[in-house]
Each structure stands twice: as structure tokens, then as C-alpha cells.
């Protein structure tokens, strides 16, 4: 199936041009999405092109500026947040990135009633996290690893925690490993629905080994970056959850929430917190060996001013074939009875589906079923449940939004998006207003992305929010590559692939092939989304065929494929890329002497192992910021899939699955190894060890480091990186510059 929807091309072919590398590096063909910042059932905020903050009322059709660009500019604000009582706005400036999600910033509070900034008891700087209460205008913020509370923006702060210490104790914010591998947020505090209570996590990193690397900067001496970072098998952070009454914070102070006994008996993680009501909270815990998760529903005991988590309200989720959940353990979406909930987990056939849980997990009612997967529950109302899945037409790389009518029996299912713009849109997400009165649909492709507003009752489209007209016009004279998504059936395994073909592709000719791989557990590369990126350029201008293959270990096709890699990373992911390459050669249009593979991060690990597979299939390849040994990577991620690097667990495979162990096999390939020296995630150590092993084996290779760059290799490094990789591939494929 050809995914790029046909466009009316100018009949004069010579007005069409190929993509250039400059187009890609300049972001010439980037697209916009529109996510409303919902503030009620029918109102949302949006930052206009000229930087005014505008409030839109869908029902009256009116809009007005609540905050002018002049006010924003007066403090160089790059972000804002309206208090729920609409009296104040926080303005965020001096953004300073830390890790993937975390950053510090300076915050100013603007009083909308008098049009002035709040003076007196100003916020300290820089702040690590700040948020409004869900009702009114209380503020909670984290400064120097401690949590503070303000009843009103102009009030003096109440200090909730006192033990916060850099790299030692983190209150209300996660440490490195929790941020990257467990919470996927910059915060670790949660307001109750009406702002009565504030829950927060405390992470104790005192005993965690530290990764230290040089940051060269511009000074005479480099400085050393120290991060408590637990690698596989190392000591982990110790987590505790506390809840404080924000109305009378000094009365009893923070109260610790008890950990379920079956979890507390050995090393464990806290995985998420969900407020149900102001006096009921749901915590999810996970054993360090991540195949057992416990969901615990806790109630406030007015008489004792404590939180009680009865054993009868503990729900266990266990995997016998792999780890618990997908990438993360799913979170519950509670029903209006404030006790039962909807949750995605594996059904008896090994597909992730929505279940309804009331008394016990054993008595769960399965809501969706089939040989496809439910991916996200967006919203549950009194009569509808909205979710996304890849059910439609059996394409795992699609996402459509469905509505299940749960107010009647049997619940009826309707696909909201399947037939809206079928050629253009096959990959959606959604954003819902309060009570799902309205929602925005954001379509990511395969055609040009489009965002639309819909009535939550009838699903009628109300208006287009963003249709990327400028992008559509800009692409009119561009020869884009053709894209197709198909599958290979190999030994009872389905390998979905995306192939990107040169514009004038001719099956009777031979083309160089580049495999782009990620391949990490629970990832998906073959998706029906729009992209004009580096590989689009390589196909359009340089005449390469590019393929992406989802092999074993990838997501949304059932547990058999997903958990195939459990405790055995680096084996089947590589085998499946190789198998696909052989199938592509059989198709007849691939020049088997010009095949390359490249990947970044996990993809760098897979591409390195594929190059060192000894098959002779690959002429050359690139690894950007690869993992080289699972002993070097984060405990939370690595142990989820590999277990522990101990003799009585899985040390043998930890040792067998390193890139270094295969150094000899790089002798007959051209290898380009790339890494940022300030990579906090996949440490430069990984590439340093590959390089050392190659040198010790006297194997020639090419390398590039990016000084002071992290895992993303951003800014000017990006341009240098893609230019460098382009030269490398063109040389490998004997393409003239």
C-alpha cells in the first residue's frame, strides 16, 4: 500500500526538485500541531502567532486576549500557566534544560485583576518545578530539592520538606533514573482533585554510585558533571511517598503512604500516583525484578489523619512471559464510583487490552479484545470511554480513536477517526476538554498533519485548528520519495517494514539499501506518520532505498513478539533485521554489494551487532550513541528486560551480548562510531569501550565525538552529524558528491 496520498503535480517535471540536505537541516518542511490548552469543558487557551495568550470559547465563538505579548516580553517569558480561578498567570523565563524532561526556570506571577506583577514574597530562582493547585490559586514549587507551598501567590511560602540536598535527596522531583526510565516527567508531586492534599515522592540517592564525566566548556579546566546513576545491578534510589494537607500543612505535617507488604519485602520502585478523589489515592509499585506490579488504593483516615491502604484494595499484575506492562506498567483510569477502574494489560491471548477492574483483577471484565492492541485510554465519562488502538484494517503502525458506549449493555464500539480523512490520516492522538464535552484530534499522517476540533457528544468536526497549508504549498514542487508499509511472514513471525523509495523508483533497477534501526523493547518504527527528514533526503536526492523493520521485541503486536527478547537483548532484534535484508535482496531491486545499516541509541547497539554478525550482508554502518554493554546502562531500563547481572541470574547473557565481544567481526565492514562526550543517558563510556576493543583487535574504524553534547546531539552538532554521516554513506555506496 502506498502511503503518501497523491497530489496534483505541476505537469512540467523540471519545476520539481529533489530534497536537499539543507532543507532537512533548516527544518524547511517541519509541520505544526495544535493542542488546545483546555481550561474548562468549552474553553481553551492558545498562544497566537504574535505571542498573545488567547482564550477561546467554543460555544459562544468568542475569543479574547488574556495576556498580551507585551507582558510576556517584559520578562522574556517562553511559557505560561493560568491559575484555575483565572486570577493569576505564572510566566516562565530563563529556561535551562537539565535532562530529558527536567529544566529550571525563573517564574513571575502576574495578577490579571490589576494587570500587575505580584510584588512581595517573590519566588526564589531558579525553580525546578512549579504548578498551580487544580482549584483556586495555591502554588506548589520545588527549589533546591525542597517543596514549598503558597496559599496565594503573594503569601510567604510554607516549607514542606527540609532534607533536600543536591544529588542526595530529591523531594517533589525525580532523580535521573526515575525521570528517564520510570515517571517520564520532570515532577514527582501530585495535587488531589480539589487541591486539599498534595502528594509527593522523596528519592534518596545517598548510596547510588555516581557517573562522572568532563564538561569542557570554555574554562582553563573542564568541570566534572556528577550524576547519581544506578547502572544494571547497582544500588537503586530509595523512594517514599508522602501526603500533606495543604489547608493546614503544619497540623500533622507530611504523612507517609505505606508500601504494600509484598512489595516492601525486597528492592522496589514506585511507578505512578493517581488521585481518585480528595480522600482516595492510587499508588502503583513494582518489584525490582519487574514482572510483578501492585496497584494500591489508599483512603484518608480522618480520625488518625493518616492514609490507609487495605490489602483488599491491592491489585496484583504479574507477567509470566516477560516484564509487567509494555514500556511502562499502564496507569488506571477511574470510574465515577471512585473505586473501579479501566486499565490496559495483557489478556489470556497475550494482547494488551482494556479491562474493567472492580473487586479483583481475577474478576476483571475484558472491554476490548482481538489480535491487535489497545494503546491508550484517553478519557472515561459517565457514558463513554475513549481509547486508541491499532485495530483498523490490521495495520499495527496506525492509531485510530474509538468510543465505547459504556452507559448501555452490551457496550457498543465506534471508530471516531477511521473514515475521517482515510488517505491523509491514519495515525491520531486526541486531547479532551473537561467531561469530554469537546476534543481535538491531531493527525500525524501519513499525509500532511492536521488538527481538528470536535463535538464530544456527536463527534462532529467543528473546525480545523491547524492544517499546515504553508507546508503543503512548499512541498508542491518537491519530489518526495514514495513510502510503502508492508509485511514479511517469516517462520511464524510477522515483520512489518516501511520502505522509502526514490521518486523515480524502477523495480528493474538496482538501488543501494540503508536500514534504519531502533529495535528497542516496546518500540515501534513502522508507523503511518508524515516525516520529511534525513532519510527522505537520502531517497529523494541520493537515490537510496531506506527500510525500517519492526522485529521481535517491538510493540503493539502481542506479547509473543514483544516478550521474545526477554532476558536475551541483542539476539533476535539483530536476526530479524538480517532476515528482512535477505528478503529485500530477493525482491530484486537491491544492489547487494551496497547495503548499510545505521541507528541511534538502542539502534546504535543493534546496528553495531548487525555489522558484527559475520553475515557479510552489510558493507558499512553507523552507530550513534550506542549502548555497548548492558552493564553500562541504567538499572530500571536494563533489568526490566535483562534481569540482574549476577551469576545466579543473567550475567552470562550480559557478557555475551556486548559489542566489544564481537570486535573481530568489524574487520570486514566500514564502521562509523559517533558519541557525545556529555551524554548523561548512554554514557560516552559505551563508545570508549567499543573503540578500545577495536583498537586492541587492530580493527580499523572511523569515529566522531561531539564535545559537551548529550544524547540528542542538538544545535550545530546536528548539522555536522548529518553532513558527516551523509559523506560516509555516499563514500560507502560510491555515490559522487
Amino acid at each position: 500500500i502506498v502511503l503518501r496520498p497523491p497530489r496534483v503535480h505541476n505537469s512540467e517535471e523540471n519545476t520539481m526538485r529533489a530534497l536537499t540536505l539543507k532543507d532537512i537541516l533548516n527544518g524547511t518542511f517541519s509541520y505544526k500541531t495544535f493542542f488546545p490548552n483546555w481550561i474548562s469543558g468549552q474553553e481553551y487557551l492558545h498562544q497566537s502567532a504574535d505571542n498573545n495568550i488567547v482564550l477561546y470559547n467554543i460555544e459562544t465563538g468568542q475569543s479574547y486576549t488574556i495576556l498580551s505579548n507585551r507582558t510576556m516580553k517584559s520578562v522574556n517569558a517562553s511559557n505560561y500557566g493560568l491559575s484555575p480561578d483565572r486570577q493569576f498567570v505564572y510566566l516562565e523565563s530563563d529556561y535551562s534544560k537539565l535532562w530529558r524532561y527536567s529544566y529550571t526556570a525563573t517564574y513571575y506571577i502576574y495578577d490579571l485583576s490589576n494587570g500587575e506583577f505580584v510584588r512581595g514574597n517573590e519566588l526564589p530562582r531558579p525553580i525546578q518545578y512549579l504548578c498551580w493547585s487544580p482549584v483556586g490559586s495555591k502554588l506548589a514549587y520545588v527549589y533546591q530539592n525542597n517543596i514549598y507551598l503558597k496559599q496565594r501567590p503573594g503569601d510567604p511560602p510554607f516549607q514542606i520538606t527540609f532534607n533536600g540536598r543536591e544529588n542526595k535527596i530529591f523531594n517533589g522531583i525525580p532523580d535521573w533514573v526515575y525521570e528517564e526510565e520510570m515517571l517520564a516527567t520532570k515532577y514527582a508531586l501530585w495535587w488531589s482533585p480539589n487541591g486539599k492534599f498534595l502528594a509527593y515522592a522523596e528519592f534518596n540517592d545517598t548510596d547510588i554510585p555516581v557517573i562522572a564525566y568532563s564538561y569542557y566548556g570554555d574554562e582553563q579546566y573542564p568541570r566534572t558533571i556528577n550524576i547519581p546513576y544506578p547502572k544494571a545491578g547497582a544500588k537503586n534510589p530509595f523512594v517514599r511517598i508522602f501526603i500533606i494537607d495543604t489547608t493546614y500543612p503544619a497540623y500533622v505535617g507530611p504523612q507517609e503512604v505505606p508500601v504494600p507488604a509484598m512489595i516492601a519485602s525486597s528492592d522496589y520502585y514506585f511507578s505512578w500516583l493517581t488521585w481518585v478523589t480528595d480522600e482516595r489515592v492510587c499508588l502503583q509499585w513494582l518489584k525490582r525484578v519487574q514482572n510483578v506490579s501492585v496497584l494500591s488504593i489508599c483512603d484518608f483516615r480522618e480520625d488518625w489523619q493518616t492514609w490507609d491502604c487495605p490489602k483488599t484494595q491491592e491489585h496484583i499484575e504479574e507477567s509470566r512471559t516477560g516484564w509487567a506492562g509494555g514500556f511502562f506498567v499502564s496507569t488506571p483510569v477511574f470510574s465515577y464510583d471512585a473505586i473501579s477502574y479501566y486499565k490496559i494489560f495483557s489478556d489470556k491471548d497475550g494482547y494488551k487490552h482494556i479491562h474493567y477492574i472492580k473487586d479483583t483483577v481475577e474478576n476483571a471484565i475484558q472491554i476490548t479484545s482481538g489480535k491487535w492492541e489497545a494503546i491508550n485510554i484517553f478519557r472515561v465519562t459517565q457514558d463513554s470511554l475513549f481509547y486508541s488502538s491499532n485495530e483498523f484494517e490490521d495495520y499495527p503502525g496506525r492509531r485510530n480513536i474509538y468510543r465505547i458506549s459504556i452507559g448501555s449493555y452490551p457496550p457498543s464500539k465506534k471508530c471516531v477517526t477511521c473514515h475521517l480523512r482515510k488517505e491523509r490520516c491514519q495515525y491520531y492522538t486526541a486531547s479532551f476538554s473537561d467531561y469530554a464535552k469537546y476534543y481535538a484530534l491531531v493527525c500525524y499522517g501519513p499525509g500532511i498533519p492536521i488538527s481538528t476540533l470536535h463535538d464530544g457528544r456527536t463527534d462532529q468536526e467543528i473546525k480545523i485548528l491547524e492544517e499546515n497549508k504553508e507546508l503543503e504549498n512548499a512541498l508542491k514542487n518537491i519530489q518526495l520519495p514514495k513510502e510503502e508499509i508492508k509485511k514479511l511472514e517469516v517462520d511464524e513471525i510477522t515483520l512489518w517494514y516501511k520502505m522509502i523509495l526514490p521518486p523515480q523508483f524502477d523495480r528493474s533497477k538496482k538501488y543501494p539499501l540503508l536500514i534504519q534501526v531502533y529495535g528497542g523493547p516496546c518500540s515501534q518504527s513502522v508507523r503511518s506518520v508524515f516525516a520529511v527528514n534525513w532519510i527522505s533526503y537520502l531517497a529523494s536526492k541520493e537515490g537510496m532505498v531506506i527500510a525500517l523493520v519492526d522485529g521481535r521485541g517491538t510493540a503493539f503486536q502481542g506479547d509473543k513478539l514483544l516478550y521474545a527478547v526477554y532476558r536475551k537483548l541483542g539476539v533476535y532484534e539483530v536476526e530479524d533485521q538480517i532476515t528482512a535484508v535477505r528478503k529485500f535482496i530477493e525482491m530484486g531491486f537491491i544492489d547487494e554489494k551496497r547495503i548499510a545499516i545505521w541507528g541511534w541509541s538502542y539502534g546504535g547497539y543493534v546496528s553495531s551487532l548487525a555489522l558484527a554478525s559475520g553475515t557479510g550482508l552489510f558493507k558499512c554502518g553507523i552507530a550513534v550513541a550506542p549502548v555497548s554493554s548492558w552493564e553500562y546502562y541504567a538499572s530500571v531500563y536494563t533489568e526490566r528486560f535483562m534481569g540482574l547481572p549476577t551469576k545466579d541470574d543473567n550475567l552470562e547473557h550480559y557478557k555475551n551480548s556486548t559489542v566489544m565481544a564481537r570486535a573481530e567481526y568489524f574487520r570486514n565492514v566500514d564502521y562509523l562510531l559517533i558519541h557525545g562526550t556529555a551524554d548523561d543517558n548512554v554514557h560516552f563510556q559505551n563508545s570508549a569501550q567499543i573503540a578500545k576493543a577495536l583498537v586492541n583487535a587492530q580493527v580499523d574504524f572511523q569515529a566522531m565525538w561531539y564535545s559537551d553534547q548529550n544524547h540528542g546531539l542538538s544545535g550545530l552538532s546536528t548539522n555536522h552529524l548529518y553532513t558527516h554521516m551523509t559523506h560516509f554513506l555516499k563514500q560507502c555506496f560510491s555515490l559522487s558528491d
Partner: antibody, heavy 122, light 107 residues
Framework: EVQLLESGGGLVQPGGSLKLSCAAS????????MSWVRQAPGKGLEWIGE????????NYTPSLKDKFIISRDNAKNTLYLQMSKVRSEDTALYYC???????????????WGQGTTVTVSS | ELQMTQSPASLSASVGETVTITCRAS??????LAWYQQKQGKSPQLLVY???TLADGVPSRFSGSGSGTQYSLKINSLQPEDFGSYYC?????????FGGGTKLEIK
């Protein structure tokens, strides 16, 4: 008008078997969860079990699980209770009950039959 | 298995009076509770579900309340047709047990 009509009751010897039926009309039987409830002479109500519309979920009170079987035939709009290994304490008035779907995912017993009497005696 | 304890087992009241029947669950049933009325020689009739929602056609003098493990059924201004037996039943987890019943008699 909703009607549930139980039949099949009577005298049965200890250790014997009996099959009760409940004919439904006046509502969408094939979309309703159905239950059996019994009441011993002069005593209170005892829940026996329930069955969902497509018979994929059947729940029993633990003490009766091994001797009673609930089933249904949606084509005939009929609910069944197969009783086996009966004892004198199974003597009771047996009701079938059906109900409305209540959000979220449970069913109340909104309508009841008039009951059929089972007497276990030698 | 959750036990339902109903009290009182019996009570006498006059027409026009207000009475309250209580039901205690051996564990939290989270408002998944129904109340039934049964008149002599008749089948039970649903009065209340979700602990406090009146079933269709039930007079407003009946009201249900409670949470957690403690629930009650209140009948304001008793009418002659209100006399009979009353049962609570939980719907939290199977088996859906009934309370022992309360016999309401005319004084």
C-alpha cells in the same frame, strides 16, 4: 410487560437431580444478566449465581458451585438451573431474576419471577 | 466472602412513623448495595441500588444512605403498604450475599 415464569419445581429425593427453567418475556433477554435466588421456608434470601448474556461468565456462591449449573438459551429466552446431589437443605422457593445494566458494569435484580418450589424429601 | 449483617431482625412501627434499617458489610463494598422489599407470599422488589439511588416507581419516602461498610434504609412517614420484609444485598464481589432481613410489622 416484563414476565419471568419459573417451572420445573417439585418433589425430589435426596441425592437426586432436577432442572428448573425460567421463561422470559417483555424485555431483551439476550442482553440481560440473569440470576437465581432461593428462599428456604421462613428464611431469608440466598443468592445462587448469575450468568452473563453470552454465557461466557457464570458465577456461583461457593457452597453450591459443585452441585448447581446455570445455563441459558437466548433463542428460547430461557434460563436454566440444573440441580444435582440435592439435600434437604436445598428445599426452598427458587426465583429467577433479571435486571438492568447499571454503570459501571453491574446489574441489579429489577424483575423477579413468582418462584417455583423445590422440596427435597425421601 | 463478604457477610452482610442486617439489624434489627424485626421491628414494629405505626403508620406515619419514620424507621431506619441498617446493614453492615464485613468489608468495604464501596456503595455497591441494593435494598429490596418483600411482602408476604410475593417476590422481592428492588427499592434502592448504588446505596442511594431509588429504583423506578419507588416513592420518595424511601431513601438509602451510607458508605464503606455501613448502610441504611430510611422510610419516612410509614404507609400501610410498607409493611413486610426488607433485605440488603451487596454487588461488590461474588457471591452477592443478602443480609438476613428485617421484618417490619404494624404496631
Amino acid at each position: 410487560e416484563v414476565q419471568l415464569l419459573e417451572s420445573g419445581g417439585g418433589l425430589v429425593q435426596p441425592g437426586g437431580s432436577l432442572k428448573l427453567s425460567c421463561a422470559a418475556s417483555g424485555f431483551d433477554f439476550s442482553r440481560s444478566w440473569m440470576s437465581w435466588v432461593r428462599q428456604a421456608p421462613g428464611k431469608g434470601l440466598e443468592w445462587i449465581g448469575e450468568i452473563n448474556p453470552d454465557s461466557s461468565t457464570i458465577n456461583y456462591t461457593p457452597s453450591l458451585k459443585d452441585k448447581f449449573i446455570i445455563s441459558r438459551d437466548n433463542a428460547k429466552n430461557t434460563l436454566y438451573l440444573q440441580m444435582s446431589k440435592v439435600r434437604s437443605e436445598d428445599t426452598a422457593l427458587y426465583y429467577c431474576a433479571g435486571g438492568y445494566y447499571r454503570y459501571p458494569y453491574y446489574y441489579t435484580m429489577d424483575y423477579w419471577g413468582q418462584g417455583t418450589t423445590v422440596t427435597v424429601s425421601s | 466472602e463478604l457477610q452482610m449483617t442486617q439489624s434489627p431482625a424485626s421491628l414494629s412501627a405505626s403508620v406515619g412513623e419514620t424507621v431506619t434499617i441498617t446493614c453492615r458489610a464485613s468489608g468495604n463494598i464501596h456503595n455497591y448495595l441494593a435494598w429490596y422489599q418483600q411482602k408476604q407470599g410475593k417476590s422481592p422488589q428492588l427499592l434502592v441500588y448504588n446505596a442511594k439511588t431509588l429504583a423506578d416507581g419507588v416513592p420518595s419516602r424511601f431513601s438509602g444512605s451510607g458508605s464503606g461498610t455501613q448502610y441504611s434504609l430510611k422510610i419516612n412517614s410509614l404507609q400501610p403498604e410498607d409493611f413486610g420484609s426488607y433485605y440488603c444485598q451487596h454487588f461488590w464481589s461474588t457471591p452477592y450475599t443478602f443480609g438476613g432481613g428485617t421484618k417490619l410489622e404494624i404496631k
